[in-house]
């Protein structure tokens, strides 16, 4: 039975040209995280594999940095980066957990972060 839950940074906004950290946290399960995939709609941004480390998709190498932790940092944001992002936790033996983050990239300097939480 899958007992875990994923907390995310929720709906967030950031300025064009700036950077943002996408972060998820899996709790309430003793399952072992084997891999975390970061996806934007149908595009794979990056993989963090527990055994094999990071892989950044070649088309995002210039604008994506691994971490902190299992999170992902998006840099040099453009308005086209607005949209849904998913953290997909592959775990053993539970299976797959998915978290959703909505990022809005704003032209102006009035961007504010949405709900925040501390990752332990």
């Amino acid at each position: 039975m899958m007992t875990g839950t994923i907390e995310t940074t929720g709906n967030i906004s950031a300025e064009k040209g700036g950077s943002i950290i996408l972060q998820c946290h899996l709790s309430s399960t003793t399952a072992q995280v084997t891999q975390v995939n970061w996806e934007q709609q149908d595009q794979l941004l990056a993989i963090c594999n527990a055994d094999l480390g990071w892989h950044i998709s070649p088309s995002f190498k210039d604008r994506v940095a691994p971490g902190p932790g299992l999170g992902l940092t998006l840099q040099s944001l453009t308005v086209n980066d607005t949209g849904e992002y998913f953290c997909i936790y592959h775990t053993y033996p539970d299976g797959t957990y998915t978290g959703r983050i909505f990022l809005e990239v704003l032209e102006s300097s009035v961007a504010e972060h949405g709900a925040r939480f501390q990752i332990p």
Epitope: T34, D51, L52, G53, W54, A65, P66, Y92
Partner: antibody, heavy 118, light 107 residues
Framework: QLQLVQSGAEVKKPGASVKVSCKAS????????MNWVRQAPGQSLEWIGV????????SYNQKFKGRVTMTRDQSTSTAYMELNSLRSEDTAVYYC???????????WGQGTLVTVSS | DIQMTQSPSSLSASVGDRVTITCRPS??????LAWYQQKPGKAPKLLVY???ALAEGVPSRFSGSGSGTDFTLTISSLQPEDFATYYC?????????FGQGTKVEIK
């Protein structure tokens, strides 16, 4: 304390196989990956592959794929690395090494010298 | 695979000297770099990980710095027990690769 103890030195003929063991103690064997790294005489270090002792996932360096087999025995907290079709350039010290944290190696076995000679 | 280029391949120094070893990966590895010390007939010993974090029990005369494609290991005041070979290793994404080593010898 954390310790990895490897099997003794081996001398093999070209074309033969060798199986090196690595017994872990001082921690929960299934909690941390076990890597195998080799070092030819006077040379640098070369990563061979990794096994996750918990669910058995194995990943090999492409250079060794097809010639190396990694296994583990949870009941004895022992990992094994078998290398087939040995050639003289496989002469090296073979180390097992834990990545206790993330993908660097902070606990090493003492090494096993494998000599391939006709 | 990421290639790790270490320099120099060897150096001679005296006790008390400041020693610097560099490591240049072939591509950006962010801060995913480790340094090891190896003495003849012994297994490597972890000194530094995440480019600058000192491993447990490592003396403070050792320090690591750098990110991206340029990293440095510094020994601020060389001690007799520091004469050894030093290797860098990236721990970004497999396959993990090592530099060719830097042998620190007594002048």
């Amino acid at each position: 304390q954390l310790q990895l103890v490897q099997s003794g030195a081996e001398v093999k003929k070209p074309g033969a196989s060798v199986k090196v063991s690595c017994k872990a103690s001082g921690y929960s064997f299934t909690d941390y990956n076990m890597n195998w790294v080799r070092q030819a005489p006077g040379q640098s270090l070369e990563w061979i592959g990794v096994i996750n002792p918990n669910h058995g996932t194995i990943s090999y360096n492409q250079k060794f794929k097809g010639r190396v087999t990694m296994t583990r025995d949870q009941s004895t907290s022992t990992a094994y690395m078998e290398l087939n079709s040995l050639r003289s350039e496989d002469t090296a010290v073979y180390y097992c090494a834990n990545n206790w944290d993330v993908w660097y190696f902070d606990v090493w076995g003492q090494g096993t010298l494998v000599t391939v000679s006709s | 695979d990421i290639q790790m280029t270490q320099s120099p391949s060897s150096l001679s120094a005296s006790v008390g000297d400041r020693v610097t070893i560099t490591c240049r990966p072939s591509e950006n590895i962010y801060s995913y770099l480790a340094w090891y010390q190896q003495k003849p007939g012994k297994a490597p010993k972890l000194l530094v990980y995440n480019a600058k974090a000192l491993a447990e029990g490592v003396p403070s005369r050792f320090s690591g710095s750098g990110s991206g494609t340029d990293f440095t290991l510094t020994i601020s005041s060389l001690q007799p027990e520091d004469f050894a070979t030093y290797y860098c290793q990236h721990h970004f994404g497999a396959p993990w690769t090592f530099g060719q080593g830097t042998k620190v010898e007594i002048k």
